[in-house]
Interface confidence: medium
Amino acid sequence: AIELVPEHQTVPVSIGVPATLRCSMKGEAIGNYYINWYRKTQGNTMTFIYREKDIYGPGFKDNFQGDIDIAKNLAVLKILAPSERDEGSYYCACDT
């Protein structure tokens, strides 16, 4: 079975300081899948952020950078200049 596991349940972030979120894929090579990132905010709205390769949701491309780390089998989402509006729960997902 394939599993995507967040590297850390909580990521403390400072305003303006780049932050990196990671999900580890268990049981399969991450390069065989397309990775997606979403953010859930207070109203329980799930907002699309990123999908391989280089597909971003509206308003996310300037401040977010998605990638996969083949060597570590990780999905990576970088927040380049975090602000308070970036608070929320982030979800990684995969598909073929």
């Epitope: 590297e7 990196t20 990638d67 780390d69 083949i70 060597a71 570590k72």
Partner: antibody, heavy 120, light 107 residues
Framework: QVTLRESGPTLVKPTQTLTLTCTFS??????????VGWIRQPPGKALEWLAL???????RYNPSLKSRLTITKDTSKNQVVLTMTNMDPVGTATYYC????????????WGQGTMVTVSS | EIVLTQSPATLSLSPGERATLSCRAS??????LAWYQQKPGLAPRLLIY???NRATGIPARFSGSGSGTDFTLTISSLEPVDFAVYYC?????????FGQGTKVDIK
């Protein structure tokens, strides 16, 4: 404060086995994502990555030396041991152990290094 | 394995000058590249990780840029303590590899 210290023989003969120990403090090798690696540097030359061991006992080796290298950890002693068999004179180098960060996955802390000479 | 080629081999500059060091990868390493500084008799020190992020305690005069195969380390104004050898390292794919180094020496 993270510190690492390498120990082992300063002189080994060709064909002998080199055993190096890295003793560290300031972090635990049972923490998710943490690794300890070995890198060597012949006199006046560039750095060469040798091996890495991770918190979950995942081990990685440089393919050019894989058949000669073994890396192990003793979490309770805060030690990582590297053995290299069949040493030859090109193995004369300073050997460093290093902490691979669980947040950047690069070598952010290094030991001072131990110089090993391979000569008969 | 990924080969990292650094240029120039030696850079002769005066304090206060700008230093530009290059690291080229034989195939794409995305942004998974670090820069280290090494002084004689000492262990390397991490300066830059993920191509452009300064490590803890590294002065702002050090900056990194690039992605894919071409990377640059810039020292905006050389201080006497900056004369050293600089190495790039990739962790995009196994085995981790280092460049052959660029020596920055005093003109």
């Amino acid at each position: 404060q993270v510190t690492l210290r390498e120990s082992g023989p300063t002189l080994v003969k060709p064909t002998q086995t080199l055993t190096l120990t890295c003793t560290f403090s300031g972090f635990s090798l049972s923490t998710y994502g943490v690794g300890v690696g070995w890198i060597r540097q012949p006199p006046g030359k560039a750095l060469e990555w040798l091996a890495l061991i991770y918190w979950n006992d995942d081990k990685r080796y440089n393919p050019s030396l894989k058949s000669r290298l073994t890396i192990t950890k003793d979490t309770s002693k805060n030690q990582v041991v590297l053995t290299m068999t069949n040493m030859d004179p090109v193995g004369t180098a300073t050997y460093y152990c290093s902490h691979e960060s669980d947040w950047s996955y690069y070598f952010d802390y290094w030991g001072q290094g131990t110089m090993v000479t391979v000569s008969s | 394995e990924i080969v990292l080629t650094q240029s120039p081999a030696t850079l002769s500059l005066s304090p206060g000058e700008r230093a530009t060091l290059s690291c080229r990868a034989s195939q794409s390493v995305s942004s998974y590249l670090a820069w280290y500084q090494q002084k004689p008799g000492l262990a390397p020190r991490l300066l830059i990780y993920d191509a452009s992020n300064r490590a803890t305690g590294i002065p702002a005069r050090f900056s990194g840029s690039g992605s894919g195969t071409d990377f640059t380390l810039t020292i905006s104004s050389l201080e006497p303590v900056d004369f050293a050898v600089y190495y790039c390292q990739q962790r995009s794919s196994w085995p981790w590899t280092f460049g052959q180094g660029t020596k920055v020496d005093i003109k």
